[in-house]
Interface confidence: medium
């Protein structure tokens, strides 16, 4: 019995659902009563899911697996794995027995995008040309381990004096911290690129250091020019710094973070002490760094509703302020593709192909193409609906008239993360059958 699975690993984002495709060719007169289907972990032989004696025997794998019962009779033995975790990565074997038996193994490659790196500088005040500084580039919650590259402002690679560490959390996701030690010139830009080698996703940030004293008078408050991009559910640091003068003490400092538009108080430090969070108890300062001029704000468990501009007010004798933008993002899941009608298809038939991708932010851009990469723009209807958390589910519907055969692919792009998720469906045969291709 010939059992077919994809040659390439199935790549799935952590937290999304993955389909491990497996198919066989049923003979005429085949009935499900004859079918024994077993999915198991290739290495340990642990049972994952089975179908026997005409019945789905259910999931033996943390209750996160399902078959496609309506498609079994057509030879589709694929397994749906829900809420993928890092620990799911590996090889799954699909055993099919009717009279004969056959098996094939499919690899699941788990991935998670890395957050936009945050950059910190130590020391971060009174810098002069010739000083040695430590620049730390931190990016969070990615998988598998990242590749990290440093460059200067002219694109020259910086490979000496770089130390990179990657630490996995309980979920197996990596936080990467890369430290560059440099001797400052008159001024300089230092950029860090964190790549996810599976997703070929690049996250990068840069810091420009101008080692000169700020003019006397108003307090010069510095924040990043670019929006801080934070993934939903992760923590974000809204960087803000000032240059304390010699003899400065925290008793002199008034620091206020507020929402730029509504002036709602977020967090404050006055009278020599942290006055705490006035923003859903999800903010914190960096108390040990305040005396060095680091007035940054940590915002925990970022939500879509947090998106917007935050103003950092610093008052010592004089005062200064600057606003930093928070851009919230969430990656879209790999699209699922459905076909209507999905049987007895012939050239000339009109079919509706639906591409659905879930829980992303901000709204996605959706592109359709045929198997030659030709864009399909006519007869496409895309709707995006936000859930209670403000995350979007996108459903894009393509109506096409079938040719002799055809591949139709849908690409869902997160415009902030520049993250692409795509699915495709190939329709072949007379009468036509359909199957998913996952790239």
């Amino acid at each position: 019995l010939e059992v077919q699975v994809p040659e390439d690993p199935v790549v799935a984002l952590v937290g999304t659902d993955a389909t491990l495709c497996c198919s066989f060719s049923p003979e005429p007169g085949f009935s499900l009563a004859q079918l024994n289907l077993i999915w198991q972990l290739t290495d340990t032989k642990q049972l994952v899911h089975s179908f026997a004696e005409g019945q789905d025997q259910g999931s033996a794998y943390a209750n996160r697996t399902a078959l496609f019962p309506d498609l079994l009779a057509q030879g589709n033995a694929s397994l749906r794995l829900q809420r993928v975790r890092v620990a799911d990565e590996g090889s799954f074997t699909c055993f099919v027995s009717i009279r004969d038996f056959g098996s094939a193994a499919v690899s699941l490659q788990v991935a998670a995008p890395y957050s936009k790196p945050s950059m910190t500088l130590e020391p971060n005040k009174d810098l002069r040309p010739g000083d040695t500084v430590t620049i730390t580039c931190s990016s969070y919650q990615g998988y598998p381990e990242a590749e990290v590259f440093w460059q200067d402002g002219q694109g020259v690679p910086l490979t000496g004096n770089v130390t990179t560490s990657q630490m996995a959390n309980e979920q197996g996701l990596f936080d990467v911290h890369s430290i560059l030690r440099v001797v400052l010139g008159a001024n300089g830009t230092y950029s860090c690129l964190v790549r996810n080698p599976v997703l070929q996703q690049d996250a990068h940030s840069s810091v420009t250091i101008t080692p000169q004293r700020s003019p006397t008078g108003a307090v010069e408050v510095q924040v990043p020019e670019d929006p801080v991009v934070a993934l939903v559910g992760t923590d974000a640091t809204l960087r803000c710094s000032f240059s304390p003068e010699p003899g400065f003490s925290l008793a002199q400092l008034n620091l206020i973070w507020q929402l730029t538009d509504t002036k709602q108080l977020v967090h404050s430090f006055t009278e020599g002490r942290d006055q705490g969070s006035a923003y859903a108890n999800r903010t914190a300062l960096f108390p040990d760094l305040l005396a060095q001029g680091n007035a940054s704000l940590r915002l925990q468990r970022v939500r879509v509703a947090d998106e917007g501009s935050f103003t950092c007010f610093v008052s010592i004798r004089d005062f200064g302020s600057a606003a930093v933008s928070l851009q919230v993002a969430a990656p879209y899941s790999k699209p699922s593709m459905t076909l209507e009608p999905n049987k007895d298809l012939r050239p000339g038939d009109t079919v509706t192909i639906t591409c659905s991708s879930y829980r992303g932010y901000p709204e996605a851009e959706v592109f359709w193409q045929d198997g030659q990469g030709v864009p399909l723009t006519g007869n496409v209807t895309t709707s995006q609906m936000a859930n209670e958390q403000g995350l979007f589910d996108v459903h894009s519907v393509l109506r096409v008239v079938l040719g002799a055969n055809g591949t139709y692919s849908c690409l869902v792009r997160n415009p902030v993360l520049q993250q692409d998720a795509h699915g495709s469906v190939t329709i072949t045969g007379q009468p036509m059958t359909h199957h998913h291709h996952h790239h």
Epitope: Q154, G155, P157, G185, S191, R195, D202, S206
Partner: antibody, heavy 121, light 106 residues
């Protein structure tokens, strides 16, 4: 129009030196690094090194480090490559090129027309 | 040193044919650039930052990446594509080029 214009062809004796110039126009000369690349007859491209005209920082391919000097004159927006102790295998076309782009993606967007250096006794 | 190995060295192709050129890096690179060079001309930027087409480059050119393999594809070759193509990296010193792939039209 952004341009790099190189000096003319040179014929040199083994053991001598050659200095090739590359005059930049149409952009701020100090904003980008200038690289030198050579191509021997019928062969591929080989990187010699670069100079940052602003800081005058240089870096060289180890293979050329002992025999090459890269300089830049900001007043005339001209970069120079001097190669000493010439031997016959240094016969090649020498190109200057601007390394341009934006963080973190850079590439050689403008090339000079090339200077043919022939080393022959 | 990161060594870039292009394959094939030479390819003779008929117009309208699909062509692939692979550039394999000996270790990970931050990004790859590609240049086109025709006889007696300076190289021209062709593809930068792994997969972005330089100005004026036709859309029949594309690049895909798998691990350290970067594959340049021309999906329907035209006569004007006859040239030598070089890949280039500068993730670490020294900056290196591939040895080049020469495309000839049959």
């Amino acid at each position: 129009e952004v341009q790099l214009v190189q000096s003319g062809a040179e014929v040199k004796k083994p053991g001598s030196s050659v200095k090739v110039s590359c005059k930049a126009s149409g952009y701020s000369f100090t904003s980008y690094t200038i690289h030198w690349v050579r191509q021997a007859p019928g062969q591929g491209l080989e990187w010699i090194g670069y100079i940052n005209p602003n800081s005058r920082n240089t870096d060289y391919n180890q293979k050329f480090k002992d025999r090459t000097t890269l300089t830049a004159d900001r007043s005339t927006s001209t970069a120079y490559m001097e190669l000493s102790s010439l031997r016959s295998e240094d016969t090649a076309v020498y190109y200057c090129a601007r390394y341009s782009g934006s963080t973190p993606y850079w590439y050689f967007d403008v090339w000079g027309q090339g200077t043919t250096v022939t080393v022959s006794s | 040193e990161i060594v870039l190995t292009q394959s094939p060295d030479f390819q003779s192709v008929t117009p309208k044919e699909k062509v692939t050129i692979t550039c394999r890096a000996s270790s990970s690179v931050s990004y790859m650039n590609w240049y086109q060079q025709k006889p007696d001309q300076s190289p021209k930027p062709w593809i930068y930052a792994t997969s972005n087409l330089a100005s004026g480059v036709p859309s029949r050119f594309s690049v895909s990446v798998s691990g350290t393999d970067h594959t340049l594809t021309i999906n329907s070759l035209e006569a004007e594509d006859a040239a030598t193509y070089y890949c280039q990296q500068w993730s670490s010193n020294p900056l290196t080029f591939g040895q080049g792939t020469k495309l000839e039209i049959k």
